[in-house]
């Protein structure tokens, strides 16, 4: 019986050229983590297995760093990064938990927006 | 090097039974998946069975669940696949295959040959 | 199961000539999608892994692209040790599915 459960960042914003910590963590539950795969939409981010230590997607080398603990720094964001980030924490016995996390990146700051829309 | 060696191959009759083994060498066995995947005379790849590198879990094809068992000794570096009730479907070349972070098949073992015939 | 549909299951094609074969998954499988090259008597050898990984010691002029369930690998200019049959295989879920193969045979 699976008993734990994902806790994540939830909804988080973040603005474009920055960075971002994506962490999850499972809880009430003794199950052994053997993995957690790091996944954006349909795309394969980044692994991080007990044994073998992480494997970040060739593809997103220049922008993904491993950790802090089993979470993923995304660098240098983009618009095009918006949208939805899941961990899936593969667990023995239990099997596998999947947390879900919402990352929308902003055009730039709340000031320069306003900028934008001062009458002339 | 990585290197991974199949045997115990050969000719056995319907009903019967085999063990296959496979001698890995050049990694650190226990912390890699391991995979046997065989293919029938003449045509595609089947999965077959998966082992987690603690051994505590295992995974099986369901043509084949019940009848083999996969097993392996992290102290040999060896992983195993019993085969029993052996039947003319099952004859195919057998190859065991490492796989990290058991998402891709990296290394794969040169295959032994299983025929199931009376 | 996740059932792996690869086309075409055979073609004809000239050294330099530009390949392209598909894998379609019955549903979806993010990208965890690998292509394996073999050739007669010899074990499969791992070419993309995830989709688009290039596995290393492999060459350049192989590419994987797609996610979800469409998945595309391409051979830039066909070499004459490319002439082999090509799988593609999901790691998805259990059990592990690959498609039938694509023959590459020399015009």
């Known amino acids: 019986m699976m008993t734990g459960t994902i806790e994540t960042t939830g909804n988080i914003s973040a603005e474009k050229g920055g960075s971002i910590i994506l962490q999850c963590h499972l809880s009430s539950t003794t199950a052994q983590v053997t993995q957690v795969n790091w996944e954006q939409q349909d795309q394969l981010l980044a692994i991080c297995n007990a044994d073998l230590g992480w494997h970040i997607s060739p593809s997103f080398k220049d922008r993904v760093a491993p950790g802090p603990g089993l979470g993923l720094t995304l660098q240098s964001l983009t618009v095009n990064d918006t949208g939805e980030y899941f961990c899936i924490y593969h667990t023995y016995p239990d099997g596998t938990y999947t947390g879900r996390i919402f990352l929308e990146v902003l055009e730039s700051s709340v000031a320069e927006h306003g900028a934008r829309f001062q009458i002339p | 090097e990585v290197q991974l060696l199949e045997s115990g191959g050969g000719l056995v009759q319907p009903g019967g039974s085999l063990r296959l083994s496979c001698a890995a060498s050049?990694?650190?066995?226990?912390?890699?998946?391991m995979h046997w995947v065989r293919q029938a005379p003449g045509k595609g790849l089947e999965w077959v069975s998966a082992?987690?590198?603690?051994?505590?879990?295992?995974y099986y094809a369901d043509s084949v669940k019940g009848r083999f068992t996969i097993s392996r000794d992290n102290s040999k570096n060896t992983l195993y696949l019993q085969m029993n009730s052996l039947r003319a479907e099952d004859t195919a070349v057998y190859y065991c295959?490492?796989?990290?972070?058991?998402?891709?098949?990296?290394?794969w073992g040169q295959g032994t040959l299983v025929t199931v015939s009376s | 199961d996740i059932q792996m549909t690869q086309s075409p299951s055979s073609l004809s094609a000239s050294v330099g000539d530009r390949v392209t074969i598909t894998c379609r998954a019955s549903?979806?499988?993010?990208?965890?999608l690998n292509w394996y090259q073999q050739k007669p008597g010899k074990a499969p050898k791992l070419l993309i892994y995830?989709?688009?990984s290039l596995q290393s010691g492999v060459p350049s002029r192989f590419s994987g692209s797609g996610s979800g369930t469409d998945f595309t690998l391409t051979i830039s200019s066909l070499q004459p040790e490319d002439f082999a049959t090509y799988y593609c295989?999901?790691?998805?879920?259990?059990?592990?599915?690959f498609g039938g193969g694509t023959k590459v045979e020399i015009k």
């Open positions: 295959a490492r796989v990290p972070y058991s998402v891709w098949m990296d290394y």
């Open positions: 050049g990694f650190t066995f226990s912390s890699y998946s």
């Open positions: 082992i987690s590198g603690s051994g505590g879990s295992t």
């Open positions: 549903q979806s499988i993010s990208s965890y």
């Open positions: 995830a989709a688009s």
């Open positions: 295989q999901q790691s998805y879920s259990t059990p592990l599915t």
